[in-house]
Interface confidence: medium
């Protein structure tokens, strides 16, 4: 009724003084490899000389934190997070950040990064668009109230209004150049 | 200024659900997270959940089979809603909103005293 | 979870004289980008809670100099150095280093 081997585990590793043997009714707890977290119960048990129970160890990294516009990054970048790990931002001048000045990983998702609104209620430049470009030339700041002009290359269809507008800083939702369905 | 207005039930019996919506002024909700704090009768603080600026939430592993949090930008509403209430859930519940710095919470609303009885 | 232990519970003080809040964390609060997310609370009677210091000494917007917060690693205090009238209530400290955010079980603050 005894145990042999330890049963493996994808990314989770065994507790404990490693033993040839284990008694009926014995427990081994596992531990996730860093950038794991346990998903359910931690142990196996030993019962009739097979052990039942299953550690499950999921990934909750995070990889790429996100793109803040008119900010850049001032904590160390990694290729990879683990859960808890913070990515602190700031804002370029004359921005101003709104919002937590961090984002964290959490189980695999970033929390929500801030903003960084010209406090002036100007815009920086319009936001580029997928196989479509501005009609004028782009400058690094527009009054507000001010608007350009997205036209798509060639074969491309626009989708949504083709002029944006700055509001409070902002620039209102820019229209998709999609390519046509062919027949 | 900042303001976060809280309205809810003050009494629910046991097994209920309780319901709370925490209006915001002053801030957007697209800008700033909130979370949910409360606080048993002559005790501390006690961390539940927040929701992040972007809609996903987060939640104190204690609560999470019980504990939703949601909102809607556009009203400037968030809702809580935690189920199957018990006696021990008696209390002051509030919500806050996340600060800039390292995720305080700066702002808080003027709380809902909810007893659980029968 | 983190455990946030205060000392002590209850903190009698004479106006204009300096008090001293503890605070004991059960894991270092020391993330891995360096810096300490420890803050610190006031709770005045009848009122929700308001944010005085944030990342250990940092102070929050409209918060009197008198209040400095200190620690490193484990061991935190918040300090006031002439203690008024409108300083009395229950003092929190709060860690939002690891998930779940905690928060000590609260230092009363009152006249002697």
């Known amino acids: 009724t005894d145990c042999l081997s330890l049963p493996s585990f994808e990314n989770a590793i065994p507790m404990g003084e490693k033993k040839d043997v284990y008694k009926a009714g014995e427990q081994v707890t596992y531990t996730c490899a860093t950038y794991y977290k346990m998903d359910g119960a931690s142990n196996v048990t030993c019962i009739n000389s097979r052990w039942t129970g299953r550690p499950t160890c999921r990934d909750t990294s995070c990889v790429n934190p996100p793109t803040v516009q008119n900010a850049y990054i001032v904590s160390r970048q990694m290729s990879k997070y683990p859960s808890g790990e913070r990515v602190r931002y700031q804002c370029r001048s004359p921005y101003e950040m709104f919002g937590d000045e961090e984002v964290m990983c959490l189980n695999g998702n970033w929390t929500e990064p801030p903003q960084c609104k010209d406090s002036t209620g100007k815009c920086g430049p319009p936001p580029p668009i997928d196989n479509g470009d501005i009609t004028s030339f782009p400058l690094s700041v527009y009054a507000p109230a001010s608007s350009v002009e997205y036209q798509c290359q060639n074969l491309y269809q626009l989708e949504g209004n083709k002029r944006i507008t700055c509001r409070n800083g902002q620039w209102s939702e820019p229209p998709k150049c999609l390519h046509p369905c062919v027949i | 200024q900042v303001q976060l207005k809280q309205s809810g039930p003050g009494l629910v019996q046991p097994s209920q659900s309780l319901s709370i919506t925490c209006t915001v002024s002053?801030?957007?909700?697209?800008?700033?997270?909130v979370h949910w704090v409360r606080q048993p009768p002559g005790k501390g603080l006690e961390w539940l959940g927040v929701?992040?600026?972007?809609?996903?939430?987060d939640y104190n592993a204690a609560f999470i089979s019980r504990l939703s949090i949601s909102k809607d930008n556009s009203k400037s509403q968030v809702f809580f809603k935690m189920n199957s209430l018990q006696a021990d859930d008696t209390a002051i519940y509030y919500c806050a909103k996340n600060g800039d710095y390292g995720y305080t919470m700066d702002y808080w609303g003027q709380g809902t005293s909810v007893t659980v009885s029968s | 979870d983190v455990v946030m232990t205060q000392t002590p519970l209850s903190l009698p003080v004479s106006l204009g004289d300096q008090a001293s809040i503890s605070c004991r964390s059960s894991q270092s609060l020391v993330h891995s980008n360096g810096n300490t997310y420890l803050h610190w609370y006031l709770q005045k009677p009848g009122q929700s809670p308001k944010l005085l210091i944030y990342k250990l000494s940092n102070r929050f917007s409209g918060v009197p100099d008198r209040f400095s917060g200190s620690g490193s690693g484990t061991d935190f205090t918040l300090k006031i150095s002439r203690v008024e009238a409108e300083d009395l209530g229950v003092y929190f400290c709060?860690?939002?280093?690891?998930?779940?955010?905690?928060f000590g079980s609260g230092t009363k603050l009152e006249i002697k």
């Open positions: 002053g801030f957007s909700l697209t800008n700033y997270g």
């Open positions: 929701i992040w600026s972007g809609g996903n939430t």
């Open positions: 709060s860690q939002s280093t690891h998930v779940p955010f905690t």
